[in-house]
């Protein structure tokens, strides 16, 4: 039975040109995390963090995605096109797959909102394949 829950940074906002940290945390389970996949709204994989093999940042994002902190991901040099949903997919054993969702809104530099700032409401979601 899957008992775990994913906590995420929920709905966040950051300024154009700035950076933001995408963070998920799996709790309430003893399952072993074997891999975390970071995905974008359009089916693009941003990065994979394999528990043993380390990070693989996808070629299209290498110049502006940094691994970490922890199992999280840092997006840099934000553009308006980065606005949208991001997903962390936790592959675990023996539970299976958990998935969390983050919504990022990129704001014009002149507007309000701080990098990695706005609206840290935690979002809980678990999903199994």
């Amino acid at each position: 039975m899957m008992t775990g829950t994913i906590e995420t940074t929920g709905n966040i906002s950051a300024k154009k040109g700035g950076s933001v940290i995408l963070q998920c945390h799996l709790s309430s389970t003893m399952a072993q995390v074997t891999q975390v996949n970071w995905e974008q709204h359009d089916h693009s994989l941003l990065a994979i963090r394999n528990a043993e093999l380390g990070w693989h940042i996808y070629p299209a994002f290498k110049d502006r995605v940094a691994p970490g902190p922890g199992l999280g991901l840092t997006l840099q040099s934000l553009t308006m096109n980065d606005t949208g949903e991001y997903f962390c997919t936790y592959h675990t054993y023996p539970d299976g797959t958990y998935r969390g969702r983050i919504f990022l809104e990129v704001l014009e530099s002149s507007g309000g909102g701080g990098a990695g700032g706005g609206g840290h409401h935690h979002h809980h979601h678990h999903h199994h394949h």
Epitope: N37, L45, H91
Partner: antibody, heavy 121, light 107 residues
């Protein structure tokens, strides 16, 4: 230039243990990457068996996990595969390969030439 | 386990023509797919990683596309050395799996 070369007996009896070695030239296996075994039954597709990471940790295909051991001999710069309790279904060409996970994800960029192992009495 | 299904099993193409090979995943693998070429008696050779990126030294006539569950390897103008078996592989999950292969033969 990185090169990998498999070696070991070409014939193994049923119920015995298959043992293969992969010698790595041009790179120290303790310096990085993960080192894999893949097999290919005659006329069929490829099946990933497992790997040993340069740190020494291992990971195996769940379908073979109970029979597989992959280990490293750092003094000889080689890694080995042991597959126990073999049957005719284990007859295959066995390949060793390197995975540069940071650059290419789960794709394997260097392969040995392969060695055919036949399980027969 | 994620199952990768390749089609067709055999593709007959004339030299100079275009070849289009298909690979379907049993579940969404985003863009975590690689393609390999294998000639008789040889080891597989990495062509494409991350669904669409050519590996070092691979000619531009090889291109990969797709995301989610459907992927394509295209060889724009087949050369004599391209007749071989091609395999796709997924690495979205922690258990890597390969397709059954497509044999590209001379028509």
């Amino acid at each position: 230039q990185v090169q990998l070369q498999e070696s070991g007996p070409g014939l193994v009896k049923p119920s015995e243990t298959l043992s293969l070695t992969c010698a790595v030239y041009g790179y120290s296996i303790t310096s990085g990457y993960s080192w894999h075994w893949i097999r290919q039954p005659p006329g069929k597709g490829l099946e990933w068996i497992g790997y040993v990471h340069y740190s020494g940790s291992t990971n195996y295909n769940p379908s073979l996990k109970s029979r597989v051991t992959i280990s490293v001999d750092t003094s000889k710069n080689q890694f080995s595969l042991k597959l126990s309790s073999v049957t005719a279904a284990d007859t295959a060409v066995y390949y060793c390969a390197r995975m540069d996970y940071g650059n290419y994800g789960g794709a394997m960029d260097y392969w040995g030439q392969g060695t055919l192992v036949t399980v027969s009495s | 386990e994620i199952v990768m299904t390749q089609s067709p099993a055999t593709l007959s193409v004339s030299p100079g023509e275009r070849a289009t090979l298909s690979c379907k995943a049993s579940q969404d693998v985003r863009t975590a797919v690689a393609w390999y070429q294998q000639k008789p008696g040889q080891a597989p050779r990495l062509l494409i990683y991350s669904a669409s990126y050519r590996y070092t030294g691979i000619p531009a006539r090889f291109s990969g596309s797709g995301s989610g569950t459907e992927f394509t390897l295209t060889i724009s103008s087949l050369q004599s050395e391209d007749f071989a078996v091609y395999y796709c592989q997924q690495y979205y999950s922690t258990q890597w799996t390969f397709g059954g292969g497509t044999k590209v033969e001379i028509k």
